[in-house]
């Protein structure tokens, strides 16, 4: 009877070790799986469009990272109280987990589009560079559903990469004409977005608090109307001291207006950036290492 | 040299509406960062914003006479026009064109930096 | 009634100084910078400092703009008898009251 119940235990630690086997081998295959699914897709800058199937709904990137899903590309989401699925670019570099939601890298986008567009989102979404504006309304549906961070990637035409980075960034409602609202800074590009870089000019730089507006729809401090003159949907004030959906410059620029794609705290205002990546994870992220 | 001159009738029946028209020589209307504007002064009184309006058709109006005021552009006649309805005595003014231009960036700021020479419209029967 | 008030008058003699206010309130000057107009008799007005301070190209340095609170002022110094005319302060007042103007102040000089 003992040699009985012994070789139970035997036959079940086995067991055991062979389901932990199993799932490192699911798990392979799944990665394996994708990995040559997207070198399938990936050839050049052809799509990268990444189907899970309905295996699960994901409420950002972080938790397709999470779930296993290693490689960079467009997967659907559904944050908390979106009505409906969408496509995001989730980058899974960078630490991983990534949510983008906006790209500039070409100018092959046009920014200067009205309240609607802003809102529900347009742009390329299916190429890996391509560019897009997520939608205001899914902005919020995101970072309302956890506190994230927010990481804008800069480039310039020089080949010098800079980055700035926020917690605790939240888009408002509707009502609220999707109200930006950012938390601490830190990165090498410098405080554009809360206009810290000098205490006199935040009252008209920072972009802190400050309502979304477009062409028709004008919602900043200034007496004429920024987006139309900046031909951009932005957070303006009056009008800004960063515009990342400005108009697609190969860097020094002369303009009427500082319409171009504008980090001032790096390039100052008559420089348009070549790329540019803003993306959110959550503050508390924590890469789920297999 | 930019230049702006007004155009329309001097004489205007009350509870008619006011017609002017302003031509710009010397630069395209449709140049961005520019809102070309309408302004009047009563006879020996001081100035009076009416409103402005982009080269795209976005338009602005002062708020006391949103009602009665509409203001166009024909870009491809380089022009812009004022329309008042409803006019009274009260409305007896010289009326000026004006271009209002952004003047800085840090923080942006506007103002009327062309005028045109004026045209005195009298409301009267 | 204009929301921006000015002196309607002014003087001064050849060589002197003069100041001319313009007084407003939190949510036109005090939030907002200030532009001044000239108008010589019988002309259209002309921009004579914008931003608060700046003058624009061809404009004298014997014109200088300042503000404090909801209060700006223009200060001709040097007076000179081609600068008898009347001056306008005008400012943005938000989008409930749009552009305004002061009611003018007459200079005249002595």
């Known amino acids: 009877l003992e040699d009985c119940a012994q070789e139970q235990m035997r036959l079940r630690a086995q067991v055991r070790l062979l389901e932990t086997r199993v799932k490192q081998q699911q798990v392979k295959i799944k990665q394996l799986l994708q990995e040559n699914e997207v070198q399938f897709l990936d050839k050049g800058d052809e799509n990268t469009v990444i189907d899970l199937g309905s295996k699960r709904q994901y409420a950002d990137c972080s938790e397709i990272f999470n779930d296993g899903y290693k490689l960079s590309g467009f997967y659907k989401i559904k944050p908390l109280q979106s009505p409906a699925e969408f496509s995001v670019y989730c980058d899974m570099s960078d630490g991983g987990g990534w949510t983008v939601i906006q790209r500039r890298s070409d100018g092959s986008e046009n920014f200067n589009r009205g309240w609607k567009d802003y809102e529900n989102g347009f742009g390329n979404f299916v190429q890996k560079h391509g560019e897009y504006w997520l939608g205001n309304k899914n902005l919020h549906f995101l970072t309302t559903q956890e506190d994230y961070t927010l990481k804008i990637d800069l480039a310039d035409f020089e080949k010098n990469s800079r980055y700035a980075q926020y917690k605790n960034f939240k888009v408002g409602d509707e009502k609220n004409f999707y109200e930006l609202n950012i938390g601490e800074y830190s990165g090498t590009a410098g405080d554009s977005l809360a206009g810290n870089f000098h205490p006199e000019v935040q009252w008209w730089a920072s972009h802190q608090r400050m309502k979304f507006s477009t062409w028709d729809r004008d919602h900043d401090n200034y007496e004429g109307n920024c987006a139309e003159e900046d031909q951009s949907g932005w957070w303006f004030n009056r009008c800004h001291s960063a515009n990342l959906n400005g108009v697609y410059y190969s860097g020094p620029y002369t303009a009427k207006t500082d319409n171009g794609i504008v980090w001032y705290t790096w390039h100052g205002w008559w420089y348009s950036l070549k790329s540019v990546v803003m993306k959110i994870r959550p503050n508390d992220f924590i890469p789920n290492v297999i | 040299q930019v230049q702006l001159q007004e155009s329309g009738p001097g004489l205007v029946k009350p509870s008619q509406t006011l017609s002017l028209t302003c031509t710009v020589s010397g630069g395209s209307i449709s140049s961005g960062g520019y809102y070309w504007s309408w302004i009047r002064q009563h006879p020996g009184k001081g100035l009076e914003w009416i409103g402005y309006?982009?080269?795209?058709?976005?338009?602005y109006y002062n708020p006391s006479l949103k009602s009665r005021v509409t203001i166009s552009v024909d870009t491809s006649k380089n022009q812009f026009s004022l329309k008042l309805s409803s006019v009274t005595a009260a409305d007896t003014a010289v009326y000026y064109c004006?271009?209002?231009?952004?003047?800085?960036?840090?923080?942006?700021?506007?103002?009327?930096?062309?005028w045109g020479q004026g045209t005195m419209v009298t409301v009267s029967s | 009634q204009s929301a921006l008030t000015q002196p309607p008058s002014a003087s001064g003699t050849p060589g002197q100084r003069v100041t001319i206010s313009c007084s407003g309130s939190?949510?036109?000057?005090?939030?907002?910078?200030v532009n001044w107009y000239q108008q010589l008799p019988g002309t259209a007005p002309k921009l004579l400092i914008y931003?608060?301070?700046q003058r624009p190209s061809g404009v004298p340095d014997r014109f200088s703009g300042s503000k404090s609170g909801t209060s700006a002022s223009l200060a001709i110094s040097g007076l000179q008898s081609e600068d008898e005319a009347d001056y306008y302060c005008?400012?943005?007042?938000?989008?409930?009251?749009?552009?305004?103007f002061g009611g003018g102040t007459k200079l005249t000089v002595l």
């Open positions: 004006a271009r209002d231009s952004v003047m800085g960036y840090a923080p942006r700021v506007r103002a009327f930096d062309i």
């Open positions: 309006i982009y080269y795209s058709g976005s338009t």
């Open positions: 005008s400012s943005w007042a938000g989008d409930l009251n749009g552009r305004l």
């Open positions: 931003s608060t301070n």
């Open positions: 939190s949510s036109n000057i005090g939030t907002n910078t």
